[in-house]
């Protein structure tokens, strides 16, 4: 049949490989789009066909599987490059078909160059290690399937440009790199170079990942609301702008969703008929502890608004907390001339000194928030 289920260009699978290294690329059809695997498809008489479009070209062309030393080959649902070349960059399509069925998907392949310190346009996976937590390991990624278990490759580990040797707390152990205890100074890019023989040739795989040292679960605490707090009173006159920051500290927790929100009289701000805006900013410490600030703003506050309950809430995997802001309507200070006149009247024209107004001792703004 002429019709073919075309899944389009699968940009989620932006495959990047290093130049002059082997690459094995599985047809994404069986991983993401179809409910059966290659073996089932093959048994059912379906054929897997590969073709490609070169970078900056529109013309689809077959892949040349007759290159010297079988540089490009297909094995089951895997397209092999032994090794890649820079001009292999392009969009690759795998199509599964027989006379009655057809399904295809394309994906981009980018062959990238690395410099002498392994820097490249490659998007690096990030591996998080807990600070001062005990022995933790990273493993050289994406090397499965390149050589049989009978082949024992050699591995060299680098941190940045430098071979890892005689580091106090980092020990290469074959495919693994062990951190006896992780410190902030261990942040950086780590590269494993894997060398293995195959059919009378030697191949190399280079894999780089970023290590980020983060807060340990041993030190994790529930969210801490720094503001609002009991020391700050938000005292406003009607018509003034009311700004209340909610600043919350979250310990780093792997895969935890940190949330901050305001309620006004127990409801979400959107459900209250007042013109309220909330702006959020987020900052992180070196160990990825997070500080979130949500500033609740009412441009022209009314006396009704000043009677409402404003509560900041925070939640993480460690728990949920809430804190109410103390909001008051400012009591207008008596005007100076009136006060003076009352003073004279009361004393029968005494010393001429104004009577102290106890209200003037209060800070009427009480804005201790940070933008």
């Amino acid at each position: 049949s002429e019709r073919c289920d075309d899944w389009g260009l699968d940009t989620m699978r932006q495959i990047q490989v290093f130049e002059d290294e082997p690459a094995r690329i599985k047809c994404p059809l069986f991983e993401h789009f179809l409910k059966f695997n290659y073996s089932t498809a093959h048994s059912a008489g379906l054929t897997l066909i590969w073709y490609w479009t070169r970078q900056d070209r529109d013309l689809e062309e077959p892949i040349n599987f007759r290159l010297p030393e079988n540089r490009i080959s297909k094995e089951k649902d895997v397209l092999w490059f032994r090794p890649t070349l820079l001009n292999d960059t392009g969009n690759y399509t795998c199509m599964l078909r027989n006379t009655t069925y057809c399904s295809k998907v394309a994906f981009p392949l980018e062959v990238v160059q690395k410099d002498s310190c392994f820097n490249s346009p490659m998007k690096l996976p990030v591996h998080k290690l807990y600070i001062e937590y005990g022995i933790q390991r990273i493993t050289c990624p994406n090397v499965d399937g390149y050589f049989p278990s009978s082949v024992k490759p050699t591995i060299t580990w680098y941190m940045g440009c430098y071979k890892i040797q005689n580091f106090n707390n980092v020990i290469p152990e074959g495919m693994n790199l062990s951190f006896l205890i992780a410190f902030i100074s261990n942040n950086g890019n780590y590269t494993c170079v894997v060398t293995y023989p195959e059919n009378g040739r030697t191949f190399h795989l280079t894999r780089t990942l970023t290590v980020k040292v983060v807060g340990s679960p041993k030190n994790a605490v529930p969210p801490v609301i720094h503001s609002p707090n009991d020391h700050v009173v938000y005292e406003k006159e009607p018509g003034e702008e009311l700004l209340i920051p909610c600043t919350v500290y979250f310990s780093f927790l792997m895969d935890s969703r940190n949330e901050v929100w305001w309620t006004i009289d127990g409801k979400k701000p959107d459900d209250i008929p007042i013109d309220v805006t909330i702006n959020e900013s987020i900052s992180h410490s070196r160990t990825e502890d997070e500080t979130r600030t949500q500033i609740l703003s009412i441009k022209k506050v009314t006396s009704e608004d000043l009677k409402r309950s404003y509560v900041c809430h925070a939640r993480s995997a460690k728990g949920e907390v809430a804190k109410a802001a103390t909001v008051k309507q400012k009591v207008p200070a008596p005007r100076y001339t009136v006060e003076l006149a009352c003073g004279f009247g009361a004393t029968g024209g005494g010393s001429g000194k104004p009577i102290p107004n106890p209200l003037l001792g209060l800070d009427s703004t009480h804005h201790h928030h940070h933008h």
């Epitope: 290093f18 160059q113 392994f118 680098y158 071979k163």
Partner: antibody, heavy 119, light 107 residues
Framework: QVQLQQSGAELARPGASVKFSCKAS????????MQWVKQRPGQGLEWIGT????????RYTQKFKGKATLTADKSSSTAYMQLSGLASEDSAVYYC????????????WGAGTTVTVSS | DIKMTQSPSSMYASLGERVTITCKAS??????LSWFLQKPGKSPKTLIY???RLVDGVPSRFSGGGSGQDYSLTISSLEYEDLGIYYC?????????FGSGTKLEIK
């Protein structure tokens, strides 16, 4: 297959400079280090330095800093070594050799270039 | 710089004999050691890398071993084409340094 073709023998006067080449073929020139090694007549091997043609990064042994300069031309897949201020002790065979990161730093060798310094 | 001490400096052996050459580094080189064979008038040929890994195409009668500072190259049964000068090289750190060589001749 991988080959390193070194330029022919050089005869030079003391104090002069000489530049010789190592042309690579059969692999991606910019992905491997190029090592350079000196061997005086009847003597052992001596590592001079290395260059990564991908970005031009070089490393030298202290003795050859200022004496040897390593360069690479990506367009022609050719590595060069220039020796300056030539003296009789620079008379030797100079080899280039391909190497990768970490594990296999020397795999394929060139045939060598003979440099003779004589007045 | 790391100093590589190779021994013996020369040796005689019979064809079919088992031959062992050693190399000692002035400090731990973490198995970053290669062995080379140079025949008269030829460029060196790489035999072994990372102390015990045979380069493709090198006969299996060659084997390497060792760790820390001490390394060895063994030829299980000497053949005529194995004659020449053997060099070790440390590449644990820059500058790379070669051993002084072992000349292997027929007894």
């Amino acid at each position: 297959q991988v080959q390193l073709q070194q330029s022919g023998a050089e005869l030079a006067r003391p104090g002069a400079s000489v530049k010789f080449s190592c042309k690579a073929s059969g692999y991606t020139f910019t992905s491997y280090w190029m090592q350079w090694v000196k061997q005086r007549p009847g003597q052992g091997l001596e590592w001079i330095g290395t260059i990564y043609p991908g970005d031009g990064n070089t490393r030298y042994t202290q003795k050859f800093k200022g004496k040897a300069t390593l360069t690479a031309d990506k367009s022609s897949s050719t590595a060069y070594m220039q020796l300056s201020g030539l003296a009789s002790e620079d008379s030797a065979v100079y080899y280039c050799a391909r190497g990768y990161f970490g594990n296999l730093v020397f795999d394929v060798w060139g045939a060598g270039t003979t440099v003779t310094v004589s007045s | 710089d790391i100093k590589m001490t190779q021994s013996p400096s020369s040796m005689y052996a019979s064809l079919g004999e088992r031959v062992t050459i050693t190399c000692k580094a002035s400090q731990d080189i973490n198995t970053y050691l290669s062995w080379f064979l140079q025949k008269p008038g030829k460029s060196p040929k790489t035999l072994i890398y990372r102390a015990d890994r045979l380069v493709d195409g090198v006969p299996s009668r060659f084997s390497g071993g060792g760790s820390g500072q001490d390394y060895s190259l063994t030829i299980s049964s000497l053949e005529y084409e194995d004659l020449g000068i053997y060099y070790c090289l440390q590449y644990d750190e820059f500058p790379y340094t070669f051993g002084s060589g072992t000349k292997l001749e027929i007894k």
